[in-house]
């Protein structure tokens, strides 16, 4: 005998919520794997900066995306399948995963706040490497997609550390149409925008983290309520 009434509502709410979560994880994982395994990227695992290979922040970022996508898919599946199957075991595992993820988020938040300057530096290096790859290997569509995302999200273009060639390519091809790059290349410096994001606009990252935390707590409560409802319905 299945759950009834309010518990049934929670069951479907949890299912829909986690199905969306699972889909989002799939998209992130798909994009990350495309970025990682596209032939035009794999032959540039180590880009040359001057005469020495650059430490590949670009790929570290992609591996983080792969991990995030995989975890999202796994947790989404547990919640989704656990809810629809009314499985106490799966829902219990789902709850445990959420508790671990919540703890990880809190730890990452504290670590991120303490190391925000280093993270900003790594993000800038990630941008520079993607930009370099997009210019050096003009077929690297994945790197172009990363650069485009940076430019459109941060409403910026280029940085004050560009080479002459990158400056020329950016001016002619890779800047958002509304960007000020044509009149003044460094007016919307992406390095500056990244620094601003990690200092002046740190509250935006904080708000995003709080929203994620609230959703996690909400899901934990729902999964526990549903688990108890399943237990009670199986008693009668």
């Amino acid at each position: 005998m299945g759950v009834e009434g309010c518990t049934k509502c929670i069951k479907y709410l949890l299912f829909v919520f986690n199905f969306v979560f699972w889909l989002a994880g799939g998209v992130i994982l798909g994009v990350a794997l495309w970025l990682r395994h596209d032939p035009q990227t794999t032959n540039l695992l180590y880009l040359e900066l001057g005469d020495k290979p650059a430490p590949n922040t670009f790929y570290v970022g992609i591996y983080i995306l792969i991990a995030v996508g995989a975890v999202m898919m796994f947790v989404g599946f547990l919640g989704c399948y656990g809810a629809i199957q009314e499985s106490q075991c799966l829902l219990g595992t789902f709850f445990t995963c959420l508790v671990i993820l919540f703890a990880c988020e809190v730890a990452a938040g504290i670590w991120g706040f303490v190391n925000k300057d280093q993270i900003a530096k790594d993000v800038k290096q990630f941008y520079d490497q993607a930009l370099q790859q997009a210019v050096v290997d003009d077929d690297a569509n994945n790197a172009k997609a990363v650069v485009k995302t940076f430019h459109e999200t941060l409403d910026c273009c280029g940085s004050s550390t560009l080479t002459a060639l990158t400056t020329s390519v950016l001016k002619n091809n890779a800047c958002p149409s509304g960007s000020n790059i044509i009149s003044n290349l460094f007016k919307e410096d992406c390095h500056q925008k990244i620094d601003d994001l990690f200092s002046g606009k740190l509250y935006l990252i904080g708000i995003a983290a709080i929203v994620v935390a609230v959703i996690m707590i909400f899901e934990m409560i729902l999964s526990m309520v549903l688990c108890c409802g399943i237990r009670n319905s199986s008693v009668y």
Epitope: E48, L49, V136, D137, D138, D139, T163, A164, L165, N172
Partner: antibody
């Protein structure tokens, strides 16, 4: 050893067309940006155009924009410069040069080919 | 009229030290783009001599050195030799014009 050999220069009347070629050897042509630089008699060097490794990106000096077209054939290791609507001021020695991303400059040059625009 | 200004000629005797200047503006040399120097010996292709203001490609003797200060750059040749007689060009990138710019060239004559 990197070698760049230009050809196709000569005498042409104003308004005429000419196609310059540059045969490259001694390096992976398909992985490098290439450029054309010219020098008019008694003048300094002037950058004309560049093309990216897979022809995605190109750019031109304002003085030649709309008249000159840069292209490449990676299977033949050859760079081209199609020059249309030629003017007397286009008279120059045209050099083909490899652009180095890491050094951010023209690291290898050809001997040049002379283009004379005169009636 | 070239964007980068070089003296049309320079001269020196063997063993002497000669300096060639290259003056630009805040949109090219002063903008932080490297200044590069090329040597063109009579009847040969231009050859990269100095890149990124002061770096020498392999094979270039250490008699050649480059430096940059503000909106100007300079090429110094110490222990001048007869085989150094050539045309020397400086080059940078101009962010306002969006083009690679060159100096008008300096003809170096080794006397005696």
């Amino acid at each position: 050893e990197v070698q760049l050999l230009e050809s196709g220069g000569g005498l042409v009347q104003p308004g005429g067309s000419l196609r310059l070629s540059c045969a490259a050897s001694g390096f992976t042509f398909s992985s490098n940006y290439m450029s054309w630089v010219r020098q008019a008699p008694g003048k300094g060097l002037e950058w004309v155009s560049y093309i990216s490794s897979s022809s995605t990106y190109t750019d031109y000096a304002d003085s030649v924009k709309g008249r000159f077209t840069i292209s490449r054939d990676n299977s033949k290791n050859t760079l081209y410069l199609q020059m249309n609507s030629l003017r007397a001021e286009d008279t120059a020695v045209y050099y083909c040069a490899r652009y180095s991303y890491s050094r951010d400059n023209f690291d290898y040059w050809g001997q040049g080919t002379l283009v004379t625009v005169s009636s | 009229q070239s964007v980068l200004t070089q003296p049309p000629s320079a001269s020196g005797t063997p063993g002497q030290r000669v300096t060639i200047s290259c003056t630009g503006s805040t949109s090219n040399i002063g903008a932080g783009y490297g200044t590069h120097w090329y040597q063109r010996l009579p009847g040969t292709a231009p050859k990269l001599l100095i890149y990124g203001n002061s770096n020498r490609p392999s094979g270039v003797p250490d008699r050649f050195s480059g430096s940059k200060s503000g909106t100007s750059a300079s090429l110094a040749i110490s222990g001048l030799r007869s085989e150094d007689e050539a045309d020397y060009y400086c080059q940078s990138y101009d962010t306002n014009l969006s083009v690679w710019v060159f100096g008008g060239g300096t003809k170096l004559t080794v006397l005696g």
